[in-house]
């Protein structure tokens, strides 16, 4: 069965900063992939990014990079402007659409009593859908 | 053949709100994002935004994200981009552009271009 | 967000000759996915909008001459016009199509020498 997790990482020099990684583990090749804070895209979550193998990358603030880090993984960059983090008690959710398995999604969030530059281990998957 | 036809130029005083329009023909309207781009005299080129025709979902250039609302008309296939508390600065031509079918932010239809002044 | 720089500001070349524009970016342009670098060219003519010359760095637009190529990748990029025309006289911008915001250089002005 196909599988998707979530890292959720700060950054050591930069409490405001965040960084997303996601990867699918599965057959197939992927076809979209999307980024979203506050839940799952299209059930209450705000998007954050979406990238395409072809087409590129489009994101949204506060994103500030989204890059593929292999065929199958992406990171995702984030800065807060503001005076304090709303990321640390966020989830954060990537949904790897993919051929010919269909979609599959997982959330995950900083553990409270992470240090900084130290990131989460890989999310168990709480949320697994495939459309 | 596709065509992208703007509103006419407009003279606006500081502090005022300008709304432009851009009347897409001559393929799928929902299928293609509208970028608006606009132009101080002289000068580069600025990236103010995008929206989704198909369903109003838009993504904006920080530096205006406070300022500029852009909505559609699927009926009129007609994208509107307004930006408020306007300054001088914000004297340009302003222009609607498609995305390109290959990639999403390479531009390959554009309008004419809607020049707005703004003074006192 | 990622920055363009061109160079040079203005340029003269000889009707027949090879006119070269460069520009860099901050970041690379290349996908790793698929190998394409996101880099776009512009032309824009006096009281026109800008036209979409080149994309992915080296894809002609269809209806672009084949004397305008683009060529490069990772952070430095070339529009060449080989054998310059009189209607080619404008302005040239290169742009990243890689990531939100896209970017432009702040242009080339290409004039007859």
């Known amino acids: 069965t196909p599988e998707v997790w979530v890292q959720v990482q700060m950054e050591a020099t930069e409490l405001s900063s965040f960084t997303v990684h996601c990867g699918f583990l599965g057959p197939g090749s992927i076809s979209l992939v999307t980024v979203s804070w506050g839940g799952p895209d299209g059930a209450g979550g705000t998007k954050l990014a979406v990238l395409h193998p072809e087409l590129g990358t489009r994101q949204w603030a506060p994103a500030r990079q989204a890059r593929w880090e292999t065929q199958s993984s992406i990171s995702l960059a984030l800065e807060d402007s503001g005076a304090s983090s709303p990321f640390a008690n966020t989830t954060f959710c990537c949904k790897f659409a993919s051929f010919p398995e269909g979609s599959w999604e997982s959330c995950g969030s900083l553990p409270p009593s992470s240090d900084p530059g130290l990131s989460a281990p890989p999310t168990p998957v709480p949320i697994l859908r495939a459309d | 053949q596709v065509q992208l036809v703007q509103s006419g130029a407009e003279v606006k005083k500081p502090g005022a709100s300008v709304k432009v329009s851009c009347k897409a023909s001559g393929y799928s309207f929902p299928s293609y994002w509208m970028h608006w781009v606009r132009q101080a005299p002289g000068q580069g080129l600025e990236w103010i935004g995008e929206?989704?025709?198909?369903?109003?979902?838009?993504n904006y250039n920080e530096q205006f994200r406070n300022r500029v609302t852009m909505t559609v008309d699927t009926s009129t296939s007609t994208v509107y981009m307004e930006l408020s508390s306007l300054r001088s600065e914000d004297t340009a031509v302003y222009y609607c552009?498609?995305?390109?079918?290959?990639?999403?932010?390479?531009?390959?239809?554009w309008g004419q271009g809607t020049l707005v002044t703004v003074s006192s | 967000d990622i920055v363009m720089t061109q160079s040079p500001d203005s340029l003269a070349v000889s009707l027949g000759e090879r006119a070269t524009i460069n520009c860099k970016s901050s970041?690379?342009?290349?996908?790793?996915?698929?190998?394409?670098?996101?880099l776009a060219w512009y032309q824009q003519k006096p009281g026109q909008p800008p036209k979409l010359l080149v994309y992915f760095a080296s894809t002609r637009e269809s209806g672009v001459p084949d004397r305008f190529s683009g060529s490069g990748s990772g952070t430095d990029f070339t529009l060449t016009i080989s054998s310059l025309q009189a209607e080619d006289v404008a302005v040239y911008f290169c742009?990243?199509?890689?990531?939100?915001?896209?970017?432009f250089g702040g242009g080339t002005k290409l004039e007859i020498k």
């Open positions: 929206i989704n025709p198909s369903n109003g979902l838009t």
């Open positions: 742009q990243q199509h890689y990531s939100t915001p896209p970017t």
């Open positions: 552009a498609r995305h390109h079918g290959s990639t999403y932010y390479a531009l390959d239809s």
């Open positions: 970041q690379s342009l290349l996908n790793s996915i698929n190998q394409k670098n996101f």
